[in-house]
Structure formats: structure tokens, C-alpha cells
Interface confidence: low
């Protein structure tokens, strides 16, 4: 049945799906706070533009009885159940914010006539790439793949003089939602990462990973994994590691590396950490005081989703254009808007662009230092520390294959 959109006559509503299954185990109250803070900002911006309209959010909760695992495994049906709820109530906002699980987003996108925009804080998987009316405000797996391929091919930096074409990927199935889809993309045979590498093997057992660290017959010196330092320590412990091993630890949504008093533990010396450039004003905001560094990005994505809607609403209203049209639904891409924490850029497919940062542990100071940054928007790497104090020989990253000379 046709669902009417509460989206005209000066009243504009945002439907926020509050799902029990979520990409991050974040209390729904915190997400509500983020949305409400976003609404206040949007109302102010619209008022400043002379637009006398009402913007509200409706929070749609699932019953939590059927879909109560808390993670994304049972999210496929939860999203559809919430859409059914909206359909039964015959009420839909101008925009749908949520879900964050790849499974549910993919299924909802598949099973609905999407004549409205969908904004997601998550949906990291490749199956959510290139969706005409979906916008993703947390770095999807595709962006990670493009960085890795770019970095692997780089051979003209003082600290990286070899192109790499091989890798191990550690994936044991217990990963968080973001890590699960990042590693899933690296594992997929039909993916950019796979077809750019000459050799790639997935390590699924702890012992496989541990054995590779000192295996003279290993096929690659590079191991990609996803998680925080504690996750690595649990796996690696204080085991000896061959001197030309490089572990790439993907830990995008974690600001802790940039905190002043953080010292890198010794087991991180063979590790390059890939994370996102930290925000500037987030620590003091009212909605984020109770959030861990990892979860700030998730709540921020909800808040930025509201600000993005406000940005598009303002443009369309100023141009006298209708909000309930396919044009509006397809407009949430290829733009930059003023986010909570500064400008936010979306690519041609509605996926957030960001600055990724590759960190190393300085053997001198035992601090995390920025080795290079990578702009996902232009697919370009910018070296930062031209003379890094690496643990690796000659302060250069080793070749990815032991015994192979310059290429």
C-alpha cells in the first residue's frame, strides 16, 4: 500500500529507525540525544535562512522480542519489520535514518520502492555500494580497499620503496560489524583488492596467524587485521616476530591513538595502524560526553545524518522544489555539507569521504606518530613523516616478499 510522506506544507519529518540490532552496541538513548542535538542545529540553520518550517524526528522502535541478539546477525528481518510498521501506520518521513547493519540495509533497499533517501551510520559491506538513494556516513569497505591498493602500489616514498602485491588477511569470524565487512571485502574474490594482488590468503585460526609470524616459508610479510591494540595483543601476545613482518591494524573508529597521554605498548612496534583523522570539537559536545572514543563516530554519524537532511531541505526549499520527488531522493550525494565537526564530503555514490591516517610506533618516543594520510575523495596518499623512526631495517618498510630485491 502507498505510504504517505509527512513531508510538505511546512512540516518535515525524519523517520529514525531505532533498531535493537546495530553496528555498534550503543544505547538507543545516546542516538536519540544525537538526533535531537542535530534537530536543534537544523532548526537554527533553517531559521537563519528565513525558512519558517517545522522539522521533527519520529523514532521507530522494534519490539525487541524477536530480534534481540543485539548485533547485526538477525538484523535482516528487523529492518523489514520496522518498514512494515511504518507502512501499517501509513506514515513515513521525508528521509529514513538507519539501519546500520549491512544485512538489513541491503534487504530493505531490495524490498522497498525507495522514493525517499536512506541515510545509514554503517552498512559497511560491498553489497551496499552504489545504491542510488542510500547515503553512508561511516567509511564503507570500498574506501578501505582503495586505500590498501593505493598503499600497496606505492613505491616512491623514502620509507616505502617497494610495491607490494601480496598479503595475509586475518579473519576469525568474531569481528565487530565494521571489521567483519572490511575483512569480508578483502576476502571476496570479486573485489578490487583481490584482483590487484598477486597473492592473498585468509588466516582463520589464531594458530595460523601465530605460526606465520616466524615462518621462514611464508608467502608474504604483510598481515592485515582489524580491531584495537588489545585485540592484537590477545592474539599475538609477546611472541617473537620476524623483523620484516608488517602488521596493518585497521582500527578506523578509534580516537585513542591521538590522546596526549597514550604510549604505544611494545607489541605494537611491528604494526601500522590505519585509523581516521580525529574530529576537533567532539569531546565537549553534550551528546558525546558519555561515549567511548570508538562510539563517538557512530553517534556523530546519526547527528550528521540529520544535518545532511537539513542541508538538502534548505537547498530544495530555497529553490522552490518539491521534497517528495525522486530528484530529492537521489540528491544526497556528490556534495559537501557543514557537519557537526566540520565539512563532510559525500562522493558520487553518497558515501562519506574522509582522511585516513596511517600511524607507526616511534622506537624513540614509544608514541604513535603519523606516517602518512590518505584522502579517500581523491584517492591520494600524502606522506607526513619523511624520516620515520621505524623498528624496520634502515627505517624503511620491508619488501612484502622476503628475499625479493628492488623492483
Amino acid at each position: 500500500s502507498q505510504v504517505s510522506q509527512n513531508c510538505h506544507n511546512g512540516s518535515y519529518e525524519i523517520s529514525v529507525l531505532m533498531m535493537g540490532n546495530s553496528a555498534f552496541a550503543e544505547p538507543l538513548k545516546n542516538l536519540e540525544d544525537a538526533v535531537n542535538e542535530g534537530l536543534e542545529i537544523v532548526r537554527g540553520r533553517l531559521q537563519n535562512a528565513g525558512l519558517n518550517v517545522t522539522v521533527n524526528a519520529t523514532f521507530m522502535y522494534s519490539d525487541g522480542l524477536i530480534h534481540n541478539s543485539g548485533d547485526c546477525r538477525s538484523s535482516t528481518c528487523e529492518g523489514l519489520d520496522l518498514l512494515r510498521k511504518i507502512s501499517n501506520a501509513q506514515r513515513m518521513g521525508c528521509v529514513l535514518i538507519g539501519p546500520s547493519c549491512t544485512y538489513s540495509t541491503f534487504q530493505m533497499y531490495l524490498d522497498t520502492e525507495l522514493s525517499y533517501p536512506m541515510i545509514s551510520a554503517g552498512s559497511f559491506g560491498l553489497s551496499c555500494d552504489y545504491k542510488e538513494t542510500l547515503t553512508r556516513l561511516m567509511s564503507p569497505a570500498r574506501k578501505l580497499m582503495y586505500f590498501l591498493v593505493n598503499f600497496w602500489k606505492t613505491n616512491d616514498l623514502p620509507f616505502k620503496t617497494y610495491s607490494w602485491s601480496t598479503s595475509y588477511v586475518y579473519k576469525n569470524g568474531t569481528e565487530t560489524e565494521d571489521c567483519f565487512w572490511y575483512l569480508n571485502a578483502l576476502e571476496a574474490s570479486v573485489s578490487y583488492f583481490s584482483h590487484e594482488l598477486g597473492f592473498k590468503v585468509v588466516l582463520r585460526q589464531d594458530k595460523e596467524f601465530q605460526d606465520i609470524l616466524m615462518d621462514h616459508n611464508r608467502k608474504s610479510n604483510v598481515i592485515i587485521m582489524c580491531g584495537g591494540p588489545e585485540f592484537l595483543y590477545k592474539l599475538k601476545g609477546d611472541r617473537a616476530v620476524a623483523e620484516d613482518i608488517v602488521i596493518i591494524l585497521v582500527d578506523l573508529f578509534n580516537d585513542q591513538y591521538f590522546e596526549d597521554n597514550v604510549t604505544a605498548p611494545d607489541y605494537m612496534k611491528n604494526v601500522l595502524v590505519l585509523t581516521l583523522s580525529p574530529g576537533n570539537s567532539l569531546l565537549n559536545s553534550s551528546f558525546s560526553r558519555n561515549l567511548s572514543p570508538t562510539k563517538r563516530d557512530f553517534a556523530l554519524a546519526y547527528l550528521n545524518g540529520i544535518l545532511l537532511f537539513g542541508h538538502m531541505l534548505k537547498i530544495f526549499l530555497e529553490n522552490g522544489e518539491n521534497i517528495t520527488t525522486p530528484k530529492f531522493a537521489h540528491a544526497f550525494r556528490n556534495l559537501t555539507f557543514e557537519g557537526y565537526d566540520g565539512p563532510v564530503t559525500l562522493d558520487d555514490w553518497g558515501d562519506v569521504d574522509s582522511t585516513m591516517v596511517l600511524l607507526y610506533t616511534s622506537v624513540d618516543t614509544k608514541k604513535y606518530k603519523v606516517l602518512l594520510t590518505y584522502d579517500t575523495h581523491v584517492n591520494k596518499t600524502y606522506p607526513v613523516d619523511m624520516s620515520p623512526t621505524f623498528t624496520w631495517k634502515n627505517s624503511k618498510l620491508p619488501n612484502d616478499i622476503t628475499g625479493r630485491g628492488p623492483q
Epitope: 531490495l110 555500494d129 570479486v190
Partner: antibody
Framework: QVQLKQSGPGLVQPSQSLSITCTVS????????VHWVRQSPGKGLEWLGV???????DYNAAFISRLNITKDNSKSQVFFTMNSLHSDDTAIYYC?????????????WGAGTSVTISS | DIQMTQTTSSLSASLGDRVTISCRAS??????LNWYQQKPDGTFKLLVY???RLQSGVPSRFSGSGSGTLYSLTISTLEQEDVATYFC?????????FGGGTRLEIK
């Protein structure tokens, strides 16, 4: 100008091997994968395999035991070898350049090499 | 493996006609559907990729549409040079597979 030129024998004896070379110009094999496809009256178009820019290979499971694809990036050449040929391998064999990620299409095709398996 | 089916193996139409060629996949291929033209001399040319994206240099009279398992290629105004065989191909999963082709001729 971007193109793929194929060279190989027209006639091959049963149980022998088929070797075709695809020489590319206008693009680098370090940036694009090259696929092999064949066309026969009986089976239509069949995707045989691909060698990706990084050197990794994917083969159609139906041909994996007798197919080998290699390349020489510096010479811009891709080499296709199929062993243990029989009469129903008679077909036109094409090399094709991979498209732009993520769409998985064949952007540009060679002119084809007509191969007859007969004694 | 995914099977691609083009039920119409040959088609005859008049110059200026609107012609639609269809293709069915054995499972959902999420728009990863491409169309190729094979001229009588055997040369292949990509026309449309990802269901509806026109390859550079292809005349705008060609267009693609579809979703899920059903896809089509449309020629809005048939011209003499469009005489060829048209193939669909799925790029969703390996092994990639093709339809059997639809031969288009002028009445």
C-alpha cells in the same frame, strides 16, 4: 589507441595444446585485468578465465584443470594455454580488457582467434 | 553458477522501429548486467554496463533497464548499422556468464 591484438594457430590436433598471445597497447597490464572468452556454435559464449592486474588468476571451474593464463607486463602480453584439446573446443577465442571497478564488464575485445581442433 | 537466458534468439524489425531485447538471470544479479553487440564480422563492442550506463561513444538510441532477474536493452529508433547479435552478461559473481544472444535483422 587502446587495443588488443591476438595471435595464434588456426588449426590444432586433438589432445594437443592451444597457445594464444594477446598483445595490448594503449593501457598497462599492471592496471587492468585481461579475460578470455570463447564462442562456439554449440555452447555460445563461455567465460574461461582472467588474469588480474596484480597477477592473480581466476578460472572457470569447468576448465581449471587444463587452462593456464600468464602475462609479461613489460611486454604488454598475456598468454593463454589450453591443454588436452578435443573437437568441441573448436571455437573463436577472444581476449578482453576488464572494465572499471566495480562493474565487472569487458570494456574492449580483441578481434578473436578462430581455432579448429581436427586431425 | 548463474544462468543467463535470452528467450528470443532472433528478431526482425523495420528501420525506425523501437526494439527491445530481454534477458533473464537465474537469480538476482543486483544490476550487474552488461550488454554487448557482435557485428556480423565477429567483433564485439560493449554497449551498456551496470544495467543502464551507456558506454562512452555508444549512440544514445541505446538504453538499458531492469532489476533483480529481468533486464532489457532498447534501441529507440532502429538503424541499418544496428544489424548484429546482442548478448547480455552478468558480472555479479564468478564465473561470469552470457545469454545465448539475440540476432537482430532488418525486415
Amino acid at each position: 589507441q587502446v587495443q588488443l591484438k591476438q595471435s595464434g594457430p588456426g588449426l590444432v590436433q586433438p589432445s594437443q595444446s592451444l597457445s594464444i598471445t594477446c598483445t595490448v597497447s594503449g593501457f598497462s597490464l599492471t592496471n587492468y585485468g585481461v579475460h578470455w572468452v570463447r564462442q562456439s556454435p554449440g555452447k555460445g559464449l563461455e567465460w574461461l578465465g582472467v588474469i588480474w592486474s596484480g597477477g592473480r588468476k581466476d578460472y572457470n571451474a569447468a576448465f581449471i584443470s587444463r587452462l593456464n593464463i600468464t602475462k609479461d607486463n613489460s611486454k604488454s602480453q598475456v598468454f593463454f594455454t589450453m591443454n588436452s584439446l578435443h573437437s568441441d573446443d573448436t571455437a573463436i577465442y577472444y581476449c578482453a580488457r576488464h572494465g572499471t571497478y566495480p562493474y565487472w564488464y569487458f570494456a574492449l575485445w580483441g578481434a578473436g582467434t578462430s581455432v579448429t581442433i581436427s586431425s | 553458477d548463474i544462468q543467463m537466458t535470452q528467450t528470443t534468439s532472433s528478431l526482425s524489425a523495420s528501420l525506425g522501429d523501437r526494439v527491445t531485447i530481454s534477458c533473464r538471470a537465474s537469480q538476482d544479479i543486483s544490476n550487474y548486467l552488461n550488454w554487448y553487440q557482435q557485428k556480423p564480422d565477429g567483433t564485439f563492442k560493449l554497449l551498456v554496463y551496470y544495467t543502464s550506463r551507456l558506454q562512452s561513444g555508444v549512440p544514445s538510441r541505446f538504453s538499458g533497464s531492469g532489476s533483480g532477474t529481468l533486464y532489457s536493452l532498447t534501441i529507440s529508433t532502429l538503424e541499418q548499422e544496428d544489424v548484429a547479435t546482442y548478448f547480455c552478461q552478468q558480472g555479479k559473481t564468478l564465473p561470469f556468464s552470457f545469454g545465448g544472444g539475440t540476432r537482430l535483422e532488418i525486415k
